[in-house]
Interface confidence: low
Amino acid sequence: GWVWNQFFVPEEMNTTSHHIGQLRSDLDNGNNSFQYKLLGAGAGSTFIIDERTGDIYAIQKLDREERSLYILRAQVIDIATGRAVEPESEFVIKVSDINDNEPKFLDEPYEAIVPEMSPEGTLVIQVTASDADDPSSGNNARLLYSLLQGQPYFSVEPTTGVIRISSKMDRELQDEYWVIIQAKDMIGQPGALSGTTSVLIKLSDVNDNKPIFKESLYRLTVSESAPTGTSIGTIMAYDNDIGENAEMDYSIEEDDSQTFDIITNHETQEGIVILKKKVDFEHQNHYGIRAKVKNHHVPEQLMKYHTEASTTFIKIQVEDVDEP
């Protein structure tokens, strides 16, 4: 009968040939009377057999990731008679893995958007690397993820590649971050290969800033001949948020005379001071009112950023008009 052990050949061998093992008949007494032959895919090009001894050699560098096993057939012939000594037999050569593939991130480019001020532990995105090496061969394809850039704002779960927030971020200070993640095989042991990917993390705005008046005092004038409804000037607050989070409403906080009103121009986000009642220079030639400004949309959970509305003082001088 045939005698052999299991055949393995390491991939990426740099030698010109590599001895894999021996195929022989137990009838072979070593006097070179038998001839061994190799048949099948790879016979003669990738593998050869010593026709006298049955020793098998790989004569080509192999790549397990391209092909992990070869199924071949062996024959042994009595040279004297030309007849088969054993029935033709099929056998397998397995290509064993070495750690020759670095982890690769297949879903690049990564981009994520998270609301600013998100709490610690908030999931941002999951990055996943793939390693072409054999997962059943030691740790060649066992990956660990780590953060090369992005501390202290982000963290990555070592075994899953899930990126989470580790420190609150303020969009008004920085609105995007580049996080660099490394995936290392061999669970980080010596001989490990690595791959990196970049993740662009953008912060979306939340309403964490209240509007604040640009000036603490505004000076306006109004003619005593001005009719009610006249716009006598504008006031303006600024808000570091953007979009609807920066939309604001102006209002009167204090006007004992009840002479003025403020309306909001939602296009320009300015407050327009309006004359509500006619004024008379001879009766009163100046007024002092206080205005306040608040955001239009404030979710309940963000009210803590909007506890005291910003206020400003407006001094209004009445201009005298000659009366007949």
Epitope: L106, D107, E108, E111, A112, I113, V114, P115, S118, P119, G121, T122, L123, V124, I125, Q126, T128, S130, I201, K202, S204, P299, Q301
Partner: antibody, heavy 121, light 107 residues
Framework: QVQLLESGGGLVQPGGSLRLSCAAS????????MNWVRQAPGKGLEWVST????????YYADSVKGRFTISRDNSKSTLYLQMNSLRAEDTAVYHC??????????????WGQGTTVTVSS | EIVMTQSPVTLSLSLGERATLSCRAS??????LAWFQQKPGQAPRLLIY???TRATGIPARFSGSGSGTEFTLTISSLEPEDFAVYYC?????????FGGGTKVEIK
């Protein structure tokens, strides 16, 4: 605008197979995760499976693991669900749903109208 | 598996009333919660994600709040088109899970 159109549903016997398709348009298909979610008659929503944008990651509900396979052809902007060994309890309307961005990458921001799968002898 | 529990199962309210829907997660899911609206014979529609961020085109009367395990969807003043079934869904952990739904019906 974003559109998702499911097809491939129908009546099948227990143990049979079906392949659902979801044709997507109006967005860069390969940039988004995609999901299958089902709804049995008169019941709530049940997540079935998710695949990442490049197809590297696939996730399945325990109830379908080993029987269903999610896949995608980014060149055709099409999502698939191969359903084998179908059971009566797989009877439902199957919706495909597009993933979102960022913290909502594995979310579901646009849904298709669904295709009906009936498993009955 | 994260279990999502919605309450109440049914909410009977009149037009213009405020609706408050609750959703509880069996363990913390941070702010990774979405709310969907579904009307009979239609596909679900995303209302809220990230616990309180309104999806594109969703009216301001819909607002979400909460984090960790307790979440709320509020409809400030019910319009005729708001009577539907509402589902919460967590996307913090695999498997993704939905709540059983809350039906908002006209009283």
């Amino acid at each position: 605008q974003v559109q998702l159109l499911e097809s491939g549903g129908g009546l099948v016997q227990p143990g049979g197979s079906l392949r659902l398709s979801c044709a997507a348009s109006g967005f860069t298909f390969s940039s988004y995760a995609m999901n299958w979610v089902r709804q049995a008659p008169g019941k709530g929503l049940e997540w079935v499976s998710t695949i990442s944008g490049g197809g590297a990651n696939t996730y399945y509900a325990d109830s379908v693991k080993g029987r269903f396979t999610i896949s995608r052809d980014n060149s055709k902007s099409t999502l698939y669900l191969q359903m084998n060994s179908l059971r009566a309890e797989d009877t439902a309307v199957y919706h495909c749903a597009k993933g979102g961005m960022g913290g909502y990458y594995y979310g579901m921001d646009v849904w298709g109208q669904g295709t009906t799968v009936t498993v009955s002898s | 598996e994260i279990v999502m529990t919605q309450s109440p199962v049914t909410l009977s309210l009149s037009l213009g009333e405020r609706a408050t829907l609750s959703c509880r997660a069996s363990q913390s899911i941070s702010s990774n919660l979405a709310w969907f609206q579904q009307k009979p014979g239609q596909a679900p529609r995303l209302l809220i994600y990230g616990a309180f961020t309104r999806a594109t085109g969703i009216p301001a009367r819909f607002s979400g709040s909460g984090s960790g395990t307790e979440f709320t969807l509020t409809i400030s003043s019910l319009e005729p088109e708001d009577f539907a079934v509402y589902y919460c869904q967590q996307y913090n952990y695999w498997p993704l899970t939905f709540g059983g739904g809350t039906k908002v019906e006209i009283k």
